[in-house]
């Protein structure tokens, strides 16, 4: 989905390259082609990253942290390409890299600033704690510190409780919001400004449904067009809350178009799925089916949560028997 890295051109022979944690990047450097090519890449003007001269690599004094992680584009050196291919970048690799290139004609020095970002796909969770209901937007690993914003019915809200834990190379962030007793829709946005990547979580509470035992219920779940892109891989999960925890009824993977159903009374309409409508039917309701039903549509860029509350009441026959 994302390019290897992207470059921002800034003056004075200096470029900024933005990479993602654990991915490979290219530090660009070019020169006027000539013979007797010597290439030295250094980090922070101190550590040897890669050396090439007399037609081959010379890595005897390479700093150990770069061992087996760097290479040049050997077939392109003669064409003036001194770029460095850099494997599995970490946050410790952030900083200034200097590329020295000497030829029979000239010496040039290029500087490349490497910035590394992390953005493991966030999640939006709905939790019950005693009598309270919470929405939690969380991201397990993110760097730099993201911007988190909440909206209620499309209006920004200032309450933004953020629980943050920092590890050696990234932050783990939870942003809980108490939504007890609310019928509003909520939206949480997490933005990584470095990677220019935004994730949105949206939560909608549908009106409660009252059904009789043995009837069937149809619960709607359609993605909001603003977020939904059918070309992007996503997953749809229907689950039911029981005793404060959710159990999965069924799920659908867009990549394989597989549907897995764990509850025999659950049904999905294939034709509707093809139209990106993930509404479901639950047949032959019984009293224990009362509760909250959650539809979760998730991709790398969004999570859409739809909550239905279903009340199953005894049918007349059942009531008269009692």
């Amino acid at each position: 989905i994302f390019p290897l890295a992207f470059f921002i051109y800034v003056p004075m022979n200096e470029q900024i390259v933005i990479g993602r944690l654990d991915e490979d990047i290219i530090l660009p450097s070019s020169f006027e082609r000539g013979s007797e090519v010597v290439i030295h890449w250094k980090y922070q003007d101190s550590y040897k990253v890669h050396s090439y001269y007399k037609g081959s690599d010379h890595l005897e004094s390479q700093d150990p942290r770069y061992a087996n992680r760097t290479s040049l584009f050997y077939n392109e050196i003669q064409n003036g390409n001194a770029s460095l291919f850099f494997r599995r970048v970490s946050l410790l690799d952030e900083g200034i890299y200097t590329c020295y290139v000497g030829t029979a004609i000239q010496v040039i020095t290029n500087k490349v600033v490497l910035k590394v970002g992390v953005f493991l796909t966030p999640v939006m969770k709905y939790e019950k704690r005693n009598t309270n209901s919470f929405l939690i937007c969380s991201v397990l690993s993110v760097y730099p510190r993201p911007i988190i914003t909440w909206k209620m019915d499309n209006t920004p809200i200032s309450e933004n409780n953020m629980e943050e834990t920092g590890s050696l190379d990234s932050f783990s962030i939870n942003s809980p919001l108490n939504i007890t007793g609310s019928n509003s829709s909520y939206e949480c946005t997490i933005e990584n400004s470095l990677l220019k990547q935004t994730w949105t979580g949206r939560w909608t509470m549908k009106d409660g449904l009252h059904k009789m035992q043995s009837e069937h219920v149809s619960l709607s779940c359609q993605p909001v067009n603003d977020y939904f892109s059918p070309n992007q891989d996503f997953k749809v999960t229907w689950s039911r809350m029981k005793s404060g925890t959710f159990s999965v009824l069924a799920y659908y993977l867009s990549s394989s178009q597989n549907t897995i159903i764990n509850e025999s009374r659950f049904s999905w309409n294939k034709e509707l799925i093809n139209q990106s409508d993930f509404s479901m039917n639950l047949m032959d309701l019984n009293l224990s089916d009362s509760g909250e039903y959650l539809c979760n549509i998730s991709s790398d860029e969004y999570t859409l949560l739809t909550i239905h509350t279903v009340h199953v009441e005894p049918s007349q026959e059942t009531a008269s028997h009692n």
Epitope: E36, V38, Y53, K54, G55, S61, Y100, G102
Partner: antibody, heavy 121, light 107 residues
Framework: QVQLVESGGGVVQPGRSLRLSCAAS????????IHWVRQAPGKGLEWVAV????????YYADSVRGRFTISRDNSKNTLSLQMNSLRVEDTAVYYC??????????????WGQGTLVTVSS | DIQMTQSPSTLSASVGDRVTITCRAS??????LAWYQQKPGKAPKLLIY???SLESGVPSRFSGSGSGTEFTLTISSLQPDDLATYYC?????????FGQGTKLEIK
């Protein structure tokens, strides 16, 4: 134009020390590796030492390793060769010479005029 | 260390002659060989690098060839100004070593 000017030569007794200097001009000093090469009177050329453009790498001929130290000051465009425990066989004209580039290539594109070091009791 | 052996040690030739100097390495040095000219009382001057590449500003009558262990410097038409001692030098690996020199005299 590129200029390398050696200084500091003279007569010194065996076992004593001497410091040679090389002043560079006409090019970006910090971009190039510099070597010392010597030539005993009436003899051939002998490579002595090299220091890379950034001072990160230094290499010496076996005959001087442990006695001679090469250094540079990029802010002053100067190269030095500190010669300790001098021997009679160190008597030579000492040339500083600029590498093609960083110091890694190992051949000598520009030479100074040389400074004579005589080790004699 | 890699030993470099030049031959002949001394060479006498006439103006206009084609002159060849040979340099042999004790082990393969690929093409990492340079040739220098040193006139009496002067510093050496680079003529050829990478066995056959002519340094900028050097007259085209000078040429180099060879690879591995056998190398030659050729002056296609000797000029009076070419009176000098010529040195080969390997830069394949530390320590860099020179041949003992070939003194070229004009008849």
């Amino acid at each position: 134009q590129v200029q390398l000017v050696e200084s500091g030569g003279g007569v010194v007794q065996p076992g004593r020390s001497l410091r040679l200097s090389c002043a560079a001009s006409g090019f970006t000093f910090s971009d190039y590796g510099i070597h010392w090469v010597r030539q005993a009177p009436g003899k051939g050329l002998e490579w002595v030492a090299v220091i890379w453009y950034d001072g990160s790498d230094k290499y010496y001929a076996d005959s001087v390793r442990g006695r001679f130290t090469i250094s540079r000051d990029n802010s002053k465009n100067t190269l030095s060769l500190q010669m300790n425990s001098l021997r009679v066989e160190d008597t030579a004209v000492y040339y500083c010479a600029r590498d093609r580039s960083s110091g890694a290539m190992g051949y000598f594109v520009y030479w100074g005029q040389g400074t004579l070091v005589t080790v004699s009791s | 260390d890699i030993q470099m052996t030049q031959s002949p040690s001394t060479l006498s030739a006439s103006v206009g002659d084609r002159v060849t100097i040979t340099c042999r390495a004790s082990q393969s040095i690929s093409s990492w060989l340079a040739w220098y000219q040193q006139k009496p009382g002067k510093a050496p001057k680079l003529l050829i690098y990478k066995a056959s590449s002519l340094e900028s500003g050097v007259p085209s009558r000078f040429s180099g060839s060879g690879s591995g262990t056998e190398f030659t410097l050729t002056i296609s038409s000797l000029q009076p100004d070419d009176l000098a001692t010529y040195y080969c030098q390997q830069y394949n690996s530390y320590s860099y070593t020179f041949g003992q020199g070939t003194k070229l005299e004009i008849k």
